[in-house]
């Protein structure tokens, strides 16, 4: 039977598909060999001869079994706000990820297209949700009894210290100042450490509304055209060439 032919190219039986690592060439009407990762189709199959594969040139790659006429170009070098986490080889594209203190504002299939610096919460604001590789820091105003006196992408609101005698009451951006020599920390929303409270609480003031973030700049990476599909089931080419496997 035609489908029992062991070697490509062969005509598939009615209603059957080509085997693994083969593709259907629409012009030849045959199942033909795909090229392995790191290679591309130099010459396409015909009824009489199989696909001829060739290695990808420098700075190009194919990651999947394929029959693309040209290897895909590796992405441009990583920008200054990025680190290269995977080098460009014949079998894989370069992958750039954001360096510490930055997050990916616009991702691509692998790695990041656009990195932006993590938001820094201003004094009076603390980190409500930390930044991740793909999401920015979320800031929130420090609740009564807590403060943050830093501009930081990591610091949370901390509880005011509890004074036996308050010299200066704390507010959202400043800790309380005690005259006593042994201050303690209050139990307050957003506190990390929860020591036993003493009976008196410090006074607090609400922060006045203000922008919660320090100005930041973001850097757009160079954006090239999307590479052609690779490793899909469609037939990428339609010309006949003479070749051997």
């Amino acid at each position: 039977l035609p489908a029992q032919v062991a070697f490509t190219p062969y005509a598939p039986e009615p209603g059957s598909t080509c085997r693994l690592r083969e593709y259907y060439d629409q012009t030849a009407q045959m199942c033909c060999s795909k090229c392995s990762p790191g290679q591309h189709a130099k010459v396409f199959c015909t009824k009489t001869s199989d696909t001829v594969c060739d290695s990808c040139e420098d700075s190009t790659y194919t990651q999947l079994w394929n029959w693309v006429p040209e290897c895909l170009s590796c992405g441009s070098r990583c920008s200054s706000d990025q680190v290269e986490t995977q080098a460009c080889t014949r079998e894989q594209n370069r992958i750039c990820t954001c360096r510490p203190g930055w997050y990916c504002a616009l991702s691509k299939q692998e790695g990041c297209r656009l990195c932006a610096p993590l938001r820094k919460c201003r004094p009076g604001f603390g980190v409500a949700r930390p930044g991740t590789e793909t999401s920015d820091v979320v800031c929130k105003p420090c609740a009564p009894g807590t403060f943050s006196n830093t501009t930081s992408s990591t610091d949370i609101c901390r509880p005011h210290q509890i004074c036996n005698v308050v010299a200066i009451p704390g507010n959202a951006s400043m800790d309380a100042v005690c005259t006593s020599t042994s201050p303690t920390r209050s139990m307050a929303p957003g506190a990390v450490h929860l020591p036993q409270p003493v009976s008196t609480r410090s006074q607090h003031t609400q922060p006045t509304p203000e922008p919660s973030t320090a100005p930041s700049t973001s850097f757009l990476l160079p954006m090239g055209p999307s590479p052609p599909a690779e490793g899909s089931t469609g037939d990428h080419h339609h010309h006949h060439h003479h070749h051997h496997h």
């Epitope: 039977l1 035609p2 032919v5 062969y10 005509a11 598939p12 039986e13 009615p14 209603g15 598909t17 259907y24 629409q26 012009t27 009407q29 045959m30 009824k47 009489t48 089931t233 469609g234 037939d235 990428h236 080419h237 339609h238």
Partner: antibody, heavy 116, light 111 residues
């Protein structure tokens, strides 16, 4: 299951244009080319040509160059046959056929009647 | 183009008897040990239905009474025993090279 469903019969006057659709389902449209076959009333089968469903490149048999146009709507997995400036000799049933050496998948056919 | 000559143009066969249809190609339709010759059955108002592919391979769901043989340029379709539902027109088709071509058809009638 694999299906090729063609548009309904058409009654046209000489000089007019007709466009027949062939909507496919049950397989990946862009893997297989699409053949078009003509059958005049009481006559045999004649291959008109084919269209590459990935690149969109058409190939026309010698007798079907000029007034015949193959096209695609890939997003809808549909192939089209358009005949311009209809003539009486275009009166026939037209079939879309999935392009394989052993062609087992045919549309049901579209009858085009050309009458003044 | 490869020309396919089918014979006879029509034949009448009694129920239960054998029907034999021949198809001769103007050049070989073989390649790599495979004969790219197919046989179709067509009934009025319907598209052709694949019966035999690669000269002798039966398409799935086709009754065993349909068989094909031949290679190179000479091919035969046999129907035995003929049943009532077999009344139809039969076409040979070569798919070895473009353009794919069809025979003129053989009309099978029951006596």
């Amino acid at each position: 299951q694999i299906q090729l469903v063609q548009s309904g019969p058409e009654l046209k006057k000489p000089g007019e244009t007709v466009k027949i659709s062939c909507k496919t389902s049950g397989y990946t449209f862009t893997i297989y080319g699409m053949n078009w076959v003509k059958q005049a009333p009481g006559k045999g089968l004649k291959w008109m040509g084919w269209i590459h469903t990935y690149t969109g490149e058409p190939t026309y048999a010698d007798d079907f160059k000029g007034r015949f146009v193959f096209s695609l709507e890939t997003s809808d997995s549909t192939a089209y046959l358009q005949i311009n400036n209809l003539k009486s000799e275009d009166m026939a049933t037209y079939f879309c056929v999935r392009r394989e050496r052993y062609g087992s998948f045919w549309g049901q056919g579209t009858l085009v009647t050309v009458s003044a | 183009d490869i020309v396919l000559t089918q014979s006879p143009a029509s034949l009448a066969v009694s129920l239960g008897q054998r029907a034999t249809i021949s198809c001769t190609a103007s050049q070989s339709v073989d390649y790599g040990g495979v004969s790219y010759m197919n046989w179709y059955q067509q009934k009025p108002g319907q598209p052709p239905k694949l019966l035999i592919y690669g000269a002798s391979n039966q398409e799935s769901g086709i009754p065993v009474r349909f068989s094909g043989s031949g290679s190179g340029t000479d091919f035969t379709l046999n129907i035995h025993p003929v049943e009532e539902e077999d009344a139809a027109t039969y076409y040979c088709q070569q798919s070895n090279e473009d353009p794919p071509t069809f025979g003129a058809g053989t009309k099978l009638e029951l006596k």
